[in-house]
């Protein structure tokens, strides 16, 4: 179980790196973030570490109310605070593992 979670964490972070470069990856991550109401791997600040992402920006799928451009110059109160690894991991532990 721990190995699966560690792999999922690594994979999620890897996909974040590809987010700005790959539309397919972007759509998968957007779906995960929107469905699980989460943002980033550990939390939204992970997006700041992606070199090609502006530091005042998260994907729109992080927003509580998703609209085009809502992730630009975001306010913390307008986005999901919880990280996706913890949130999706909890769901996996409960329903799959």
């Amino acid at each position: 179980r721990d190995k699966v979670m560690s792999e999922f964490n690594n994979n999620f972070r890897q996909q974040m790196e590809n987010y700005p470069k790959n539309n397919h990856t972007a759509s998968i991550l957007d779906r995960m973030q929107a469905d699980f109401k989460c943002c980033g791997a550990a939390n939204y600040t992970d997006w700041e570490k992606i070199p090609s992402m502006s530091k005042n920006r998260v994907p729109d799928s992080c927003c509580i109310n998703v609209t085009v451009g809502c992730g630009i110059n975001f306010n913390e109160k307008a986005i999901h605070k919880e990280g996706c690894v913890e949130k999706i991991g909890g769901w996996l532990r409960k329903n799959v593992l």
């Epitope: 502006s54 530091k55 005042n56 920006r57 451009g69 630009i72 110059n73 109160k77």
Partner: antibody, heavy 119, light 108 residues
């Protein structure tokens, strides 16, 4: 009413330190990012630093990086700027500024506090 | 970093004139452009946000337009209290938050 009041400015010698404070009232302080913006005598506006709602995220202009530290205390509706290793070029009026973010613009400014760095 | 360039840097006009100030961004900033007015010895005041939205309490003679890289602030009929310095500012890609160098509007 919505208000920002800066304090702590004054005359300081080069390489000295100063701590600016900003007291916020009339709004929910932690709903907003906060900025320090300065204006040297006869010059334009220069962004200095900003801090996120929770204080988790902080950024600085290259000109002050490593010398200035921004912080906030949401329990006391207060914003701070610790300024160390001050230089003559830091002489300016320093404004505390509220920022709702997104595309809304910086909508509330304090009256400013003057910092003079001179020997 | 995104650079903001305002023109002109100073401008003389008379009460009742229509005045236009332009601001150009070094790369596209969509509509993330704000305009501020500053009078001597006072703090700046937000006039226009999101390129064209009038901030509450600002007279309707002020208007903004543009998107991408080119923006304008227009004062349809100058009033005595409008003589001040005007700044544009982008919030599309920060840090840093960047301002134009300012346009000083003087009485002719």
């Amino acid at each position: 009413q919505v208000q920002l009041v800066e304090s702590g400015g004054g005359l300081v010698k080069p390489r000295g330190s100063l701590r600016l404070s900003c007291a916020a009232s009339g709004f929910i302080f932690d709903d907003y990012f906060m900025n320090w913006i300065r204006q040297a005598p006869g010059k334009g506006l220069e962004w200095v630093s900003y801090i996120s709602n929770s204080g988790n995220t902080k950024y600085y202009a290259d000109s002050v990086k490593g010398r200035f530290t921004i912080s906030r205390d949401n329990a006391y509706n207060s914003l701070y700027l610790q300024m160390n290793s001050l230089r003559a070029e830091d002489t300016a009026v320093y404004y505390c500024v509220r920022d709702p973010r997104s595309y809304y613009g910086m909508d509330v400014w304090g009256q400013g506090t003057t910092v003079t760095v001179s020997s | 970093d995104i650079q903001m360039t305002q023109s002109p840097s100073s401008l003389s006009a008379s009460v009742g004139d229509r005045v236009t100030i332009t601001c150009r961004a070094s790369q596209s900033i969509s509509s993330y452009l704000n305009w501020y007015q500053q009078k001597p010895g006072k703090a700046p005041k937000l006039l226009i946000y999101a390129a064209s939205s009038l901030q509450s309490g600002v007279p309707s003679r002020f208007s903004g337009s543009g998107s991408g890289t080119d923006f304008t602030l227009t004062i349809s009929s100058l009033q005595p209290e409008d003589f001040a310095t005007y700044y544009c500012q982008q919030s599309y890609s920060t840090p840093p938050i960047t301002f134009g160098q300012g346009t000083r509007l003087e009485i002719k």
